[in-house]
Amino acid sequence: LEVQVPEDPVVALVGTDATLCCSFSPEPGFSLAQLNLIWQLTDTKQLVHSFAEGQDQGSAYANRTALFPDLLAQGNASLRLQRVRVADEGSFTCFVSIRDFGSAAVSLQVAAPYSKPSMTLEPNKDLRPGDTVTITCSSYRGYPEAEVFWQDGQGVPLTGNVTTSQMANEQGLFDVHSVLRVVLGANGTYSCLVRNPVLQQDAHGSVTITGQPMTFPPEA
């Protein structure tokens, strides 16, 4: 029995519903009474959902899963996973047994977009060219971990003196804080780009600093 699932991971946004597709080719005369369908976590073999003895046996996974009962007889064994969480990410195995049997694993990739970065400056007043300032770019509640890039007003990447930290909250979503230490020119724009590598989503923040003009002591 050939069991088919998508080769590419299924990408689902946190809080939305995802469909893990799985199909098989029933032989002529196939009846649902013969079907034993198991969805389980690939690594731990924890039961997620099952269909046995001609009946949907329900969700064993936080009551957030459902089959498509009207489509089972046509060989559609797909699983609906509701209100996706970060903890759901991973591989799910679809196992189908009739007379023959087969299985295949589908990957679920969870994602959440990052918020528009907020920019803070320290110190934030009486700045002069030559001063060293700390610019912090903060973006919240994204998944998976972000990639952070800094550049100046001319689009030149700034890679030195950057410290980035990412902390997961209780839902597994990341808050990212990236700190750039820079010596001010006469004036300048500093941009931070927070990229979600799964969604290919870029969130931009920028700050423009106008330095006070340099004052020199009068010549003797």
Epitope: L1, N36, A52, F95, R99, F101, S103
Partner: antibody
């Protein structure tokens, strides 16, 4: 008449390898999942490996994964079990069995494997 | 993995008597249970599958019952050819489809 004839069992030293065969006849071999099951000297039955009809899925107990490989040649109506790094606890009678779902509806007569120095 | 516990390990009975062998699964296997009979020097033979379905050729004195985690095989009016070993095996879900430890049924 459904028939499965196992062969390839032998006396082998620990660490050695052996390949068992099961020649099937009397049914459409390519339509059925097949398993190897062994019976230890104390008469316990132990599931060893399973393969589905097309050979796309194979299943093993964690304890044997990596050492044993099940395969099939549907053109030759033959099931195989490659056993490597054999241990004394692999000593058993090895049966091939045909599946109807998870239940095994026909078994061969078995082939004996003894692992001893 | 699902564990199968079979009892008794052995029993000695007379021809004509009725015997019951039980099998317990460590978690629900619904009705996906098979029983096998093995006579001395022979390979196992399927006796019952899906708890109570008898393959063609199996005498009606054999009957299976149960569901979930508790199952039994009953043999009415034992015949001389019924003596041997009996094994239960679950066939629910993905392998391993484990076997019980076996019951040796001998003539008293």
């Amino acid at each position: 008449e459904v028939q499965q004839v196992e062969s390839g069992g032998d006396l082998v030293k620990p660490g050695g390898s052996l390949k068992l065969s099961c020649a099937a006849s009397g049914f459409t071999f390519s339509s059925y999942g097949m398993s190897w099951v062994r019976q230890t000297p104390d008469k316990r039955l132990e599931w060893v490996a399973t393969i589905n009809s097309g050979g796309s899925n194979t299943y093993y107990p964690d304890s044997l994964k990596g050492r044993f490989t099940i395969s099939r040649d549907n053109a030759k109506n033959t099931l195989y079990l490659q056993m490597r790094s054999l241990k004394s606890e692999d000593t058993a009678m090895y049966y091939c069995a045909r599946h109807d779902g998870g239940a095994m509806d026909y078994w061969g007569q078995g082939t004996s494997v003894t692992v001893s120095s | 993995d699902i564990q199968m516990t079979q009892s008794p390990a052995s029993l000695s009975v007379s021809v004509g008597e009725t015997v019951t062998i039980t099998c317990r699964a460590s978690e629900s296997i619904y009705s996906y249970l098979a029983w096998y009979q093995q006579k001395q020097g022979k390979s196992p033979q399927l006796l019952v599958y899906n708890t109570k379905t008898l393959p063609e050729g199996v005498p009606s004195r054999f009957s299976g019952s149960g569901s979930g985690t508790q199952f039994s095989l009953k043999i009415n009016s034992l015949q001389p050819e019924d003596f041997g070993r009996y094994y239960c095996q679950h066939h629910y879900g993905t392998p391993p489809w484990t076997f019980g430890g076996g019951t040796n049924l001998e003539i008293k």
